[in-house]
């Protein structure tokens, strides 16, 4: 039985050249967790796995930390970026939770003027 | 080439104990999680039990829960199954799978497996 | 723990025949569906992970398709050595569950 819940950052905006941390959070449930996919529609970018630690996909490894905590950082934005991101929890005993975050890379003068999206 | 190779099957009575090993080579053992997964004669697949690359979590469905313990000895890329209380349900043939480290319920190589058969 | 359900259980195919095989989830398991195969007397071999991703050294002639509780798997030309029973696996929650297997034979 899937009691829990994944919280994420929502829709967020972050400016060309900068960075951005990418988090979610599993609540309302004792189950263990895992490992912590993070992906950008299908491409892997990251794991965070409970015996191993962090693995950065080679790809990403000039652009991409870990952390804080369970998130991820990427840097060096460009308009690229923009897109759908997920965070997936492995966890037991109830399985698989996936939580979404779409990110707006905007030009730094669009950005400057204010983000079209606020974190909830 | 990753290769998986089973042992220690055979004839058991029922209440009897026994322990399957899986000897494993072509891949750095110790960073993938590894299940044993049986099929009864004629009949399909269970899952049976997975363990994490470093040995710190274990889980099991309800039908091994107690009598099945599934460990590993990374130092000598060895895979093992106890299994304690044999009923004539579990006879099967039982294989040792490698897990793919994205995605930890995948089953991506399969050993060819060892028959264990629970008979008075 | 999450039923899968297969059909058909056996089909009857020639060579070239386009043929489809469904696998069904007692709940919502998202994308996370494997596809395998396995022949008379060997080991299963992973086919499809994440209901539509080819695995590694798989023919493009297998896909995968669907999401949520309805799966499909097709091999769009059938060939000599996809003569084999498939079978599916859910990778949404424990206990990880297979579905009873589809045996594909030659017509």
């Known amino acids: 039985m899937m009691t829990g819940t994944i919280e994420t950052t929502g829709n967020i905006s972050a400016e060309k050249g900068g960075s951005i941390i990418l988090q979610c959070h599993l609540s309302s449930t004792t189950a263990q967790v895992t490992q912590v996919n993070w992906e950008q529609q299908d491409q892997l970018l990251a794991i965070c796995n409970a015996d191993l630690g962090w693995h950065i996909s080679p790809s990403f490894k000039d652009r991409v930390a870990p952390g804080p905590g369970l998130g991820l950082t990427l840097q060096s934005l460009t308009v690229n970026d923009t897109g759908e991101y997920f965070c997936i929890y492995h966890t037991y005993p109830d399985g698989t939770y996936t939580g979404r975050i779409f990110l707006e890379v905007l030009e730094s003068s669009v950005a400057e003027h204010g983000a079209r999206f606020q974190i909830p | 080439e990753v290769k998986l190779v089973e042992s220690g099957g055979g004839l058991v009575q029922p209440g009897g104990s026994l322990r399957l090993s899986c000897a494993a080579s072509?891949?750095?053992?110790?960073?993938?999680?590894m299940s044993w997964v049986r099929q009864a004669p004629g009949k399909g697949l269970e899952w049976v039990a997975v363990?994490?690359?470093?040995?710190?979590?274990?889980f099991y469905p309800d039908s091994v829960k107690g009598r099945f313990t599934i460990s590993r000895d990374n130092s000598k890329n060895t895979l093992y199954l106890q299994m304690n209380s044999l009923r004539a349900e579990d006879t099967a043939l039982y294989f040792c799978?490698?897990?793919?480290?994205?995605?930890?319920?995948?089953?991506?190589?399969w050993g060819q497996g060892t028959l264990v058969t629970v008979s008075s | 723990a999450i039923q899968m359900t297969q059909s058909p259980s056996s089909l009857s195919a020639s060579v070239g025949d386009r043929v489809t095989i469904t696998c069904q989830a007692s709940q919502n398991i998202n994308v996370w569906l494997s596809w395998y195969q396995q022949k008379p007397g060997k080991a299963p071999k992973l086919l499809i992970y994440?209901?539509?991703t080819l695995a590694s050294g798989v023919p493009s002639r297998f896909s995968g398709s669907g999401s949520g509780t309805d799966f499909t798997l097709t091999i769009s030309s059938l060939q000599p050595d996809d003569f084999a029973t498939y079978y599916c696996?859910?990778?949404?929650?424990?206990?990880?569950?297979f579905g009873g297997g589809t045996k594909v034979e030659i017509k």
């Open positions: 072509g891949f750095a053992f110790s960073s993938f999680d």
């Open positions: 799978t490698r897990q793919d480290y994205r995605y930890p319920y995948i089953m991506d190589y």
């Open positions: 994440k209901a539509s």
């Open positions: 363990i994490s690359s470093g040995g710190s979590y274990t």
């Open positions: 696996q859910q990778g949404q929650s424990y206990p990880w569950t």
